[in-house]
């Protein structure tokens, strides 16, 4: 039950983080205009990873897309990649982790080939994670870079009198968006992994030996469990220290290493 | 056509309260903001404030502590209201309608004179 | 507050000349997330509200001879009158859009001989 529990909540907190990494990736505030120590302004910017728009106070906003891939800075397309790799990512995780789910049944799949496919998902989750928080954490340095350096010379007088303020930006709404998501997606991954492990089969599952005793035929069927005596106790190789209960992970299934106490 | 029509008092004595309505026609009145701008006589413009279309509102900071800027979605109706007025707040008062993606105030009332005297 | 100066304070021309009148801001009018200028020019003739002439610093509103330019980029900005008629009479201002208070200039008079 709690490995079915930890896949089924991985794979919910996987699908909430993609979701959102796919909605920061598409938000136009991943920078916003600095009002901080600036004049009173009736002319809001704000840019994204597409786009730059233009909010202005009568609420009419102006949105102009990036028409050019060359002339783009490289640490904006290296996020736009890292972004995209984590969605692509994601999304195929998705799509595996759904077959790999323990309480969706297709066919006669093999508990061992849901625990690949949950591990393979779960890894999936955690590469889409990292590369949305690094992409994220890229904007966010780039971000923090320029704002020093749009700092150090915010003001150029012109003859004592003119002021030109260069426009700063700081975080949007779009980096703590990523950065949340990534991390969920990150756990969902996680706990994919873990839940992988509580799918696997025993590795050393034997097949009975008979042994012929003189006098008496007697099969020898060991459980494979230390509690077990091996002598025709615990035949179907199910846990002895249940007190008779059956849980759902137990019906139909191998037991698993990882299933002593 | 749109229109904006201002209507005041005309005089107003000292240390009175000041109150305008701008009723506007021949357009949205939920999709504009709406400006006030004054002229004392022989003087340039002042501006007043503004309510945007969703009803917030600026104020020029000097005049903030005694203007108030409202309005009446129903009867497409703005209203400035000016306290403690002074002789100096003489002047013709403009409501002008928000150019909205265009730069400046693109349509403006005919003004009405407030004229501060006892 | 942003000032707007405008100089000159008057001028008078003969009808069919050429007349430039100039507008200086004390910051830079000029947005850079869309690279708009934040100034627009009115024309005020006697006994009349203003009228908006440009905005955008070059735009002209709909319905005004061709004959008026707007001109110039973030601080330093131009009105320009190609061949001035004589119904041109009026006080022109420049006013910032960007900033708040939004602040007029004090005017140029155009005085036709």
């Known amino acids: 039950m709690a490995v079915t529990a930890c896949q089924g909540l991985g794979f919910v907190v996987s699908l909430i983080g993609i979701a959102g990494i796919i909605a920061a990736t598409c938000m136009d505030q991943w920078s916003t205009q600095d009002l901080y120590n600036n004049p009173v302004t009736a002319v809001f910017n704000y840019q994204g990873l597409w786009r730059s728009c233009v909010r202005e106070s009568s609420g009419f906003t102006e949105c102009r897309g990036y028409f050019t891939l060359l002339g783009l800075p490289a640490m904006l397309q290296a996020v736009r990649a890292l972004m995209i790799v984590g969605i692509v990512l994601g999304a195929i995780g998705l799509l595996v982790s759904i077959f790999a789910l323990k309480c969706i049944r297709i066919g006669s799949m093999e508990d061992s080939a849901k625990a690949n496919m949950t591990l393979t998902s779960g890894i999936m989750f955690i590469v889409s994670g990292l590369c949305a928080i690094a992409g994220v954490s890229v904007f966010a340095n780039m971000l923090v870079t320029n704002f020093w350096m749009s700092t150090a010379n915010m003001y150029t007088g012109m003859g004592g009198m003119v002021q030109t303020v260069q426009t700063r930006y700081t975080f949007g709404a779009a980096l703590f968006v990523g950065w949340v998501a990534g991390g969920l997606t990150l756990i969902g991954g996680v706990m994919m992994c873990i839940a992988c492990r509580g799918l696997a089969p025993e590795e050393t599952n034997y097949k009975a030996v008979s042994y012929h005793a003189s006098g008496h035929s007697v099969a020898y069927k060991p459980g494979g469990f230390k509690a077990s005596t091996g002598f025709g106790s615990n035949t179907k190789n199910k846990k002895i220290y249940d007190g008779g209960a059956r849980t759902e992970d137990e019906v139909q299934s191998y037991p698993s290493k990882h299933d002593y106490v | 056509q749109v229109q904006l029509k201002e209507s005041g008092p005309g005089l107003v004595a000292p240390s009175q309260s000041l109150s305008i309505t701008c009723t506007v026609s021949?357009?949205?009145?939920?999709?504009?903001?709406v400006h006030w701008v004054r002229q004392p006589p022989g003087k340039g413009l002042e501006w007043l404030g503004v309510?945007?279309?969703?009803?917030?509102?600026d104020y020029n900071a000097a005049l903030m502590s005694r203007l108030s800027i409202r309005k009446d979605n129903s009867k497409s109706q703005v209203f400035l209201k000016m306290n403690s007025l002074q002789i100096a707040d003489t002047a013709m008062y403009y409501c002008?309608?928000?150019?909205?993606?265009?730069?400046?105030?693109?349509?403006w009332g005919a003004g009405t004179t407030v004229t501060v005297s006892s | 507050d942003i000032v707007m100066t405008q100089s000159p304070s008057s001028l008078s021309v003969s009808a069919g000349e050429k007349v430039t009148m100039n507008c200086k801001s004390s910051?830079?009018?000029?947005?850079?997330?869309?690279?708009?200028?934040?100034l627009a020019w009115y024309q005020q003739k006697p006994g009349q509200p203003p009228k908006l002439l440009i905005y955008?610093?070059?735009t002209r509103e709909s319905g005004v001879p061709d004959r008026f330019t707007g001109g110039g980029s973030g601080t330093d900005f131009t009105l320009t009158i190609s061949s001035v008629q004589a119904e041109d009479l009026a006080i022109y201002y420049c006013q910032n859009d960007h900033f708040y208070p939004f602040t007029f200039g004090s005017g140029t008079k155009l005085e036709i001989k």
């Open positions: 021949g357009f949205s009145f939920t999709s504009y903001g």
């Open positions: 309510i945007w279309a969703g009803g917030s509102t």
């Open positions: 955008g610093a070059s």
């Open positions: 002008a309608r928000d150019g909205h993606g265009k730069v400046g105030f693109d349509v």
């Open positions: 910051q830079s009018l000029l947005n850079s997330g869309n690279q708009k200028n934040y």
